[in-house]
Interface confidence: medium
């Protein structure tokens, strides 16, 4: 049971994470214009990865498009990537993930097979939530550098402060929700690593424990649903079942009624 | 090119109201505040108050509130003002402005209103 | 309300003068001031913006400074078309406040 709630609660921890990395990186609001001693008739200007934007003092926005690719720093193409590649790996994690869900059942899918999964979606999470983490933190950091710059330069000159005032940028609300969704996705993803654990079959072999009763012999696996039914011979303590023990969460191989609940 | 094109002269009496008209060509009419600003005959420039065509959003001087009633029709791009209550000392040329930033970058010509018993 | 104070009131100099006209606000406005001219019977024009900044079509003769509380406009090299009544105002905060103005005039 607990490690269905581990494996549930990773995948929708980790797809709150994901739809956070979608949403920040659609988001126009990852750098935003320093607002101090602004004037109230001010511009306010704020930037995305895709476009950036300019709201009126009115309140009318307008948004242009950054048609232009080479034109571009390398920085915040190196953003985009880090955040494409987080959400393509978010996106195939969670695909995988679905399948791997102990409460969903795909014909006679081994728990083995299951484990596996929900490895490979925990580590594309992993993954996924550290790309996410490491491109807004590029980003962070190369708005912490400028803003410093832009505020040496406005006083430095001859008589004090330069006269053409930089705009200067700081954080928008998409770098908190990049760094929140981040780190969603990664925990969901340790969440559903940790779940793998409890899923993955363990290597140690039950033996059998023989009942002699009228001249054959039924061997019964402790907590399990084989049973080997032999005659004559078969009185010795054998290995009935070699497959590797399943854990008590286990679920028949074959339907039951508590399949599809 | 933008333009802001004002209403006629006004001659009114002491007592009534008044209300001219700027319309807005060359820009988006939503987009920028239209400024109002009052210029009495040979002396400095006085703010008035501001309407947001965007909102619907009116900000008076506090010397002018109760005074001046600022609107607008977007559909004709228009803004108007409205001064209630005349004496000689509304007598002024009253311009509208379109401000960018701080600065008004493009003035109407001006509506000369006269009060005069 | 910030209060404008421009001075001299009235300026007479000859051409080819440099004339500087200044603008003391009560209270911090950083560089959010503009200054402009106005001909008798005219509307008044956009010179400087952003303390500093010439406005597009502006002859480079003039020219602003000053943030905070303090700024000037300067004009190099008096022109016959530059006599005319100079307005500073800041943008700072509402309600927008205009100096008094500055009527330059010819010697």
């Known amino acids: 049971m607990a490690v269905t709630a581990c494996q549930g609660l990773g995948f929708v921890v980790s797809l709150i994470g994901i739809a956070g990395i979608i949403a920040a990186t659609c988001m126009d609001q990852w750098s935003t214009q320093d607002l101090y001693n602004n004037p109230v008739t001010a511009v306010f200007n704020y930037q995305g990865l895709w476009r950036s934007c300019v709201r009126e003092s009115s309140g009318f926005t307008e948004c242009r498009g950054y048609f232009t690719l080479l034109g571009l720093p390398a920085m915040l193409q190196a953003v985009r990537a880090l955040m494409i590649v987080g959400i393509v790996l978010g996106a195939i994690g969670l695909l995988v993930s679905i399948f791997a869900l102990k409460c969903i059942r795909i014909g006679s899918m081994e728990d083995s097979a299951k484990a596996n999964m929900t490895l490979t979606s925990g580590i594309m999470f992993i993954v996924s939530g550290l790309c996410a983490i490491a491109g807004v933190s590029v980003f962070a950091n190369m708005l912490v550098t400028n803003f410093w710059m832009s505020t040496a330069n406005m006083y430095t000159g001859m008589g004090g402060m330069v006269q053409t005032v930089q705009t200067r940028y700081t954080f928008g609300a998409a770098l908190f929700v990049g760094w929140v969704a981040g780190g969603l996705t990664l925990i969901g993803g340790v969440m559903m690593c940790i779940a793998c654990r409890g899923l993955a079959p363990e290597e140690t072999n039950y033996k059998a424990v023989s009942y002699h009763a009228s001249g054959h012999s039924v061997a019964y696996k402790p907590g399990g649903f084989k049973a080997s039914t032999g005659f004559g011979s078969n009185t010795k303590n054998k290995k009935i079942y070699d497959g590797g023990a399943r854990t008590e969460d286990e679920v028949q191989s074959y339907p039951s009624k508590h399949d599809y609940v | 090119e933008v333009q802001l094109q004002q209403s006629g002269p006004e001659l009114v009496k002491p007592g009534a109201s008044v209300k001219m008209s700027c319309k807005a060509s060359?820009?988006?009419?939503?987009?920028?505040?239209i400024h109002w600003v009052k210029q009495k005959p040979g002396q400095g420039l006085e703010w008035i108050g501001y309407f947001n065509p965007y909102n619907d959003d009116s900000k008076n001087n506090e010397k002018f509130k109760g005074k001046a009633t600022l609107t607008s029709d977007k559909s004709s791009s228009t803004a108007y003002m409205e001064i209630s209550s005349l004496t000689s000392e509304d007598s002024a040329v009253y311009y509208c402005?379109?401000?960018?930033?701080?600065?008004?970058?493009?003035w109407g010509q001006g509506t000369l209103v006269t009060v005069s018993a | 309300d910030i209060q404008m104070n421009q001075s001299p009131s009235s300026l007479s100099a000859s051409l080819g003068d440099t004339i500087t006209i200044t603008c003391h606000v009560s209270q911090n406005i950083d560089v959010w001031l503009s200054w402009y001219q106005q001909k008798p019977g005219n509307i008044p024009k956009l010179l400087i913006y952003k303390a500093s900044n010439l406005h597009t079509g502006v002859p480079s003769r003039f020219s602003g400074s000053g943030s905070g509380t303090g700024f000037t406009l300067t004009i190099s090299s008096l022109q016959p078309e530059d006599i005319a009544t100079y307005y500073c105002?800041?943008?700072?905060?509402?309600?927008?406040?205009f100096g008094a103005g500055t009527k330059l005039e010819l010697k």
């Open positions: 105002q800041q943008g700072q905060s509402y309600p927008l406040t």
């Open positions: 060359g820009y988006t009419f939503t987009r920028y505040i």
């Open positions: 402005a379109k401000l960018r930033q701080e600065r008004i970058a493009y």
